[in-house]
Interface confidence: low
């Protein structure tokens, strides 16, 4: 133990920090299996053959790349979040849908529209989301634009949740936006379509109030040869939850100290 | 000490505790020198008698009252930060001053604007500063309003700082937005009038813009007899910075370990 | 700050973050996990030296303050300040798994 | 969380946020801060359990080992978690100031 | 607009126990400080203590064994527990905010409840 | 415990009168002194804080004044609706707020 210690970590003390580091890693070791909530690690019998499903690496990718607008992970967390989150996605509605029909010739605007069927298949119940983020691939772009999300509220109303100024950019960029209290809501709601709305930011008194930004999946093709890739990198929403079979364990087990 | 502390970790660890304390306190004695880079208190024979000055009080009030839109300290905070900042208020420039001629008959937005010599008074030095608060006093209100914060970027044209959503309120409240990145830019120009635009939220498709917030020492005054409260409570720059004298110090005695 | 970038690159004896990569097969003896193979966990280590006496060079004593004691605490000790998650890939049974572990890797450390 | 509300209402053996009002003039001897006349400075104290043994009633050590050893630490310290700046008054010659002190009140501790 | 309501007074016997709530409206209760105060009858007021935003405690010394102050921020309530009462605990007990100026102005009682009777007899 | 002690308890003055209410402190309390008025059947009032800055809405006829262990509320034209008693209290921290045990102002 180091604590209030004024001695340097001399030669003398190179076993104390092989001990630190055996501890760490047991610690580690408890760390890794409590969070999953498991008593010793799982059997791997029935794991098939061959490589990770492509689907699935995507996801895990996905998860492990920080993106624009998303920070690290806050700390300190609350309790239920120690425990470790299953991570799926959920794709917009296919662009083909006749939802989209009436949102074509608005150009200031962009709309995403949700299944929360869908949602509701991966998060069976709204406390056990712990993070919704919508992520959408912007094309490459040469002009600087500031840029709004909004919620679907009622017919014909939308509700502001965010903006972001885009800055120029060689490459294709992932957004991400935090949702987690919108997709909180529409999991209380009944099954339906739900969606968001991102928009140009019109000021008072500007005339130009056209979106200039282009998102992979929602702007025209430009290469036939891209509509799988495209499809692939179409807006979608991350979800985080607590497995509905650990949420109950959590549930029963829980005590105050 | 006569705080309640019916917690006790057990009699026989009491002694423990209180020597706990004890370090605490000494560790404290030693952060608040060393915070304002004392050796020693400071003499107290120059001192004048009687309370303190009103304008002083109303600045520790100011810095120790959390406002709608401030966050808690920030922790982790760079070296600098370490060391205590001396807290001065800058208020805007007076409604009758010719400069507000043009902007009287526009509905969507009010207009602040602040010398920056009175600026350069408090901070003689960009680096010095390490925040900067516009605080403005929202009066009471019963409608939602979105609303949005520009600088004054060039002759015509606005720059978008931030928003927030002010929900109905009963009585008067302190709005506070970070605006430390453009304090530091007025102070790296030269001296001249800067200011700032209050707007209501325009969206692409909205007929009202109209901005419904009334702001204390901006909007019409209700009553004559408010006169000096009204104006001690217009809006105001909260200017936090390392004093010139500490600054010198700092930079003289900086190493790395 | 005490993070990676000071920290791996220096030979400080105070409350630093050192490396630490754990490799799940070899350190933990697990196949279980599919990705990543292991990570970068780091730990945080090193005395946080109480020097508060104005009888000692007057600058240093505030700068070793300064880093080692921004809490002021009885007894500041070497913990992690920033964090960062860890996702994995596992099987349950036939169904692959991604799941986000949080706060798994130490980017900083601090005296508090 | 290890906060006030918790830890003042409960007597909690472990890790926790403890009282401690600092009266500038009766603990420090200081009448040079005209304002505050004192302020809840806090402190953390308390062990780190470190509680992870599969044989042990399984939920009891989950829920203990979640609450004390967030960060798996080699050896968890309780420090402080959440801090708040505290401003005063002074006088330098005729000159009041106004300063404000970063981190000064302990608001909740965690073990890390 | 600024509104103090306490309940749970009444008529109880010695050495039984009774919690009074003071129920807050109009301000945001769990930025302030909160005290309770008690007169009895024909006489002056008392102040049997405080509670700060945090949950921090302070109580008049003849308080301390048998008076407990605690708040529920969530349900902006504020509660005194009472235990063991005697005769002489007999009065009208107050919740008042605390003012919240500079310094420790927070046991200046800006605004009071109506109060809540509270007797002592067997 | 710092103990408070006004003076006189009670007093009988007319409409129109200046009345003087003195508070003594049992050890100095800098100017954390408060002052309250005190109708039958309602709550307490806050009249006055720090010894002498006037709360809002209060008339002006109303004044305080002291530091450290004496201090005096003053009203310098008694009006109808002044009749009741008035406390003074101390705040100088947690271990000494305690109130005066209350001086009634009567008709004559």
């Known amino acids: 133990d180091y604590k209030d210690d004024d001695d340097k970590l001399s030669t003398s003390k190179t076993i104390d920090m092989e001990l630190v580091k055996r501890k760490r890693i047991e610690a580690i070791r408890g760390q890794i299996l409590s969070k999953l909530r498991l008593a010793s690690p799982p059997s791997q019998g029935e794991v098939p053959p061959g490589p990770l499903p492509e689907a699935v690496l995507a996801l895990y990718n996905s998860t492990r790349d920080r993106v624009a607008g998303e920070s690290a992970d806050p700390e300190p967390e609350p309790e239920a979040d120690y425990y470790a989150k299953e991570v799926t996605r959920v794709l917009m509605v296919d662009r083909n849908n006749a939802i989209y029909e009436k949102t074509k010739d608005i150009s200031h605007s962009i709309y995403m529209f949700f299944n929360t069927s869908d949602i509701r298949e991966a998060v069976p119940e709204p406390p056990l989301l712990s993070r919704a983020e919508l992520r959408l691939q912007r094309l490459k772009s040469s002009v600087e634009q500031h840029v709004e999300l909004y919620q679907k509220y009622s017919n014909n109303s939308w509700r502001y949740l965010g903006n972001r100024l885009l800055t120029p950019t060689d490459t294709p960029e992932w957004l991400s936006f935090d949702v987690t209290g919108v997709v909180r809501q529409w999991l209380n709601q009944g099954d339906g379509i739900q969606g968001f709305r991102f928009s140009a930011h019109c000021s008072c008194d500007s005339k130009d109030n056209k979106l200039h930004v282009e998102i992979n999946g929602i702007s025209p093709k430009r290469r036939g040869d891209l509509g799988t890739i495209h499809d692939m990198n179409r807006p979608f929403l991350l979800l985080m939850a607590t497995p509905l079979e650990r949420a109950q364990h959590l549930h029963s087990s829980r005590h105050r100290r | 000490d006569y705080k309640d502390d019916d917690d006790k970790l057990s009699t026989s660890k009491t002694i423990d505790m209180e020597l706990v304390k004890r370090k605490r306190i000494e560790a404290i004695r030693g952060q608040i020198l060393s915070k304002l880079r004392l050796a020693s208190p400071p003499s107290q024979g120059e001192v004048p008698p009687g309370p303190l000055p009103e304008a002083v009080l109303a600045l520790y009030n100011s810095t120790r009252d959390r406002v709608a839109g401030e966050s808690a300290d920030p922790e982790p905070e760079p070296e600098a930060d370490y060391y205590a900042k001396e807290v001065t208020r800058v208020l805007m420039v007076d409604r009758n001053n010719a400069i507000y001629e043009k902007t009287k008959d526009i509905s969507h937005s009010i207009y602040m604007f602040f010398n920056t010599s009175d600026i350069r008074e408090a901070v003689p030095e960009p680096p010095l500063l390490s925040r900067a608060e516009l605080r403005l006093q929202r009066l009471k209100s019963s409608v939602e309003q979105h609303v949005e914060l520009y600088q004054k970027y060039s002759n015509n044209s606005w720059r978008y700082l931030g928003n927030r959503l002010l929900t109905p309120t009963d009585t008067p409240e302190w709005l506070s937005f970070d605006v430390t990145g453009v304090v530091r830019q007025w102070l790296n120009q030269g001296d001249g009038i800067q200011g700032f635009r209050f707007s209501a939220h325009c969206s692409c498709d909205s007929k009202d813009n109209k901005l419904h917030v009334e702001i204390n020492g901006i909007s019409p005054k209700r009553r004559g007899d408010l006169g000096t409260i009204h104006d001690m409570n217009r809006p105001f720059l909260l200017l936090m910075a390392t004093p010139l004298e500490r600054a010198q110090h700092l930079h003289s005695s900086r190493h790395r370990r | 700050a005490l993070d990676t970038n000071y920290c791996f690159s220096s030979t400080e004896k105070n409350c630093c973050v050192r490396q630490l990569y754990i490799d799940f097969r070899k350190d933990l003896g697990w196949k279980w996990i599919h990705e990543p193979k292991g990570y970068h966990a780091n730990f945080c280590l090193g005395p946080c030296p109480y020097i508060w006496s104005l009888d000692t060079q007057y600058s240093k004593v505030l700068a070793l303050y300064n880093q080692h004691n921004p809490g002021a605490s009885a007894s500041p000790c070497c913990v992690p300040q920033a964090l960062e998650p860890l996702p994995i890939v596992y099987y349950v049974g036939r169904k692959p798994k991604v799941e986000q572990l949080s706060n798994m890797i130490v980017r900083s450390c601090k005296c508090s | 969380a290890l906060d006030t509300n918790y830890c003042f209402s409960s007597t909690e053996k472990n890790c926790c946020v403890r009282q401690l009002y600092i009266d500038f003039r009766k603990d420090l001897g200081w009448k040079w801060i005209h304002e505050p006349k004192g302020y809840h400075a806090n402190f953390c104290l308390g062990p780190c359990p470190y509680i992870w043994s599969l044989d042990t009633q399984y939920s009891k050590v989950l829920a203990l080992y979640n609450q004390h050893n967030p960060g798996a630490s080699a050896s968890p310290c309780c420090v402080p978690q959440a801090l708040e700046p505290l401003p005063i008054v002074y006088y330098v010659g005729r000159k009041p100031k106004v300063e404000q002190l970063s981190n000064m009140i302990v608001r909740s501790c965690k073990c890390s | 607009q600024v509104q103090l309501v306490e309940s749970g007074g009444g008529v109880v016997q010695p050495g039984r126990s009774l919690r009074l709530s003071c129920a807050a409206s109009?301000?945001?209760?769990?930025?302030?400080?909160m005290n309770w105060i008690r007169q009895p009858p024909g006489k002056g007021l008392e102040w049997i203590g405080y509670?700060?935003?945090?949950?921090?405690?302070y109580r008049a010394n003849w308080a301390r064994g048998r008076f407990t102050i605690s708040r529920d921020n969530s349900k902006n309530t504020l509660y005194l527990q009472m235990n063991s009462l005697r005769a002489e605990d007999t009065a009208v007990y107050y919740c008042?905010?605390?003012?919240?100026?500079?310094?420790?102005?927070?046991?200046?009682?800006?605004?009071w409840g109506q109060g809540t009777l509270v007797t002592v007899s067997s | 415990d710092i103990q408070m002690t006004q003076s006189p308890s009670s007093l009988s003055a007319s409409v129109g009168d200046r009345v003087t209410i003195t508070c003594q402190a049992s050890?100095?309390?800098?100017?954390?002194l408060a002052w309250y008025q005190q109708k039958p059947g309602q709550p307490p009032k806050l009249l006055i804080y720090a010894a002498s800055t006037l709360e809002w809405g209060v008339p002006s006829r109303f004044s305080g004044s002291g530091s450290g262990t004496d201090f005096t509320l003053t009203i310098s034209s008694l009006q109808p609706e002044d009749f009741a008693t008035y406390y003074c209290q101390s705040y100088s921290d947690g271990d000494s707020v305690g109130f005066g045990q209350g001086t009634k102002v009567e008709i004559k």
């Open positions: 050890q100095s309390i800098s100017t954390y």
């Open positions: 008042a905010r605390g003012w919240h100026i500079f310094g420790h102005h927070y046991w200046v009682m800006h605004f």
């Open positions: 509670i700060y935003t945090s949950g921090t405690t």
């Open positions: 109009g301000f945001h209760f769990s930025s302030e400080a």
